[in-house]
Interface confidence: low
């Protein structure tokens, strides 16, 4: 098993650009989530999903969209990149 695969590793965007961060897991996990970590702060939940077709907002969903069409994939889309979205992003999955 590859576990959780997140791409790209690095990305530079101009303000206003949109992009998608891909996240896939091959462990048949139902729960998947996206977090952001800013300097000096802990992980903050952006969006999460408890199963295919089900998504919900976390603490900081502003400016992001997610979809969960399959159990394996949980892409995070930055709708219109802003300086405030400069961060390190983590995807996670669990049973």
């Amino acid at each position: 098993n590859a576990g959780v695969t997140q791409t790209p590793k690095f990305q530079v965007l101009k303000t206003g650009q949109s992009m998608t961060l891909q996240c896939a897991q091959d462990m048949n996990h139902e729960y998947m989530s996206w977090y952001r970590q800013d300097p000096g702060m802990g992980l903050r939940l952006i969006h999460y999903s408890v199963g295919a077709g089900i998504t919900d907002q976390g603490e900081v969903p502003n400016g992001y969209n997610v979809s969960r069409s399959t159990t394996e994939d949980f892409p995070l889309r930055l709708l219109s990149a802003a300086p405030s979205q400069t961060s390190v992003y983590f995807c996670a999955s669990s049973y």
Epitope: D56, Q57, G58, E59, V60, P61, N62, G63, L79, S80, A82, P83, S84
Partner: antibody, heavy 119, light 107 residues
């Protein structure tokens, strides 16, 4: 720091319209949502609608649909809320509020604009 | 629409008291609840978001908890500046809705 400064008090006649402005500063105007909420005298808070300047997306409370129009001028970082066909029960303090942490969490509030509808 | 019902509507307490305000949602809203404080003649101020997360600058005596349909705001030791009206707000679905408010008065 984030500031939302609203236009001054208005007195309007029944049947007329009012347009309230909300000028934002201290953050990137196109990045965060602007909401409009009203509070009638001695009453609770009532959400009217929201606007995302970054995309132009608008959502209205069905209760106000057809009577409320939310717009913005990104060049001046100003949002507007226009309410038409005013009646006495529209007498209230109207607030704009900005969402930073989440689409629909009202983090920052303007000082409020009192609108009085009276013949 | 999701109804948010707060209790009590009025609460008399003394400086130093521990007080708890409850908010019940008419349907499951997850943790998508915010607590606001409003002083007379002033705009509301957000205190707690996502049920239990304090905003920067909000004193630690304020805490929130709950998920699903029942939420609480607790002030561990009332200070004179805490006497105000408190509103809960759900952001699970549109239209966004608020509780009717709890007015916290000095006993």
């Amino acid at each position: 720091q984030v500031q939302l400064v609203q236009s001054g008090a208005e007195v309007k006649k029944p049947g007329s319209s009012v347009k309230v402005s909300c000028k934002a500063s201290g953050y990137s105007f196109t990045t965060y949502y602007i909401h409009w909420v009203r509070q009638a005298p001695g009453q609770g808070l009532e959400w009217m609608g929201e606007f995302f300047p970054g995309s132009g997306n608008i959502k209205y409370n069905e209760k106000f649909k057809g009577r409320v129009t939310i717009t913005a001028d990104t060049s001046t970082s100003t949002a507007y809320m226009e309410l038409s066909s005013l009646r006495s029960e529209d007498t209230a303090v109207y607030y704009c509020a900005g969402s930073y942490y989440s689409y629909d969490v009202l983090d920052y509030w303007g000082q409020g604009t009192t609108v009085t509808v009276s013949s | 629409d999701i109804q948010m019902t707060q209790s009590p509507s009025f609460l008399s307490a003394s400086v130093g008291d521990r007080v708890t305000i409850t908010c019940k949602a008419s349907q499951n809203v997850g943790i998508n609840v915010v607590w606001h404080q409003q002083k007379p003649g002033k705009a509301p101020k957000a205190l707690i978001y996502s049920s239990s997360h304090r905003y920067s600058g909000v004193p630690s005596r304020f805490s929130g908890s709950g998920s699903g349909t029942e939420f609480t705001l607790t002030i561990s030791s009332l200070q004179p500046e805490d006497f105000a009206t408190y509103f809960c707000q759900q952001f699970k679905s549109y239209p966004l809705t608020f509780g009717q408010g709890t007015k916290l008065e000095i006993k």
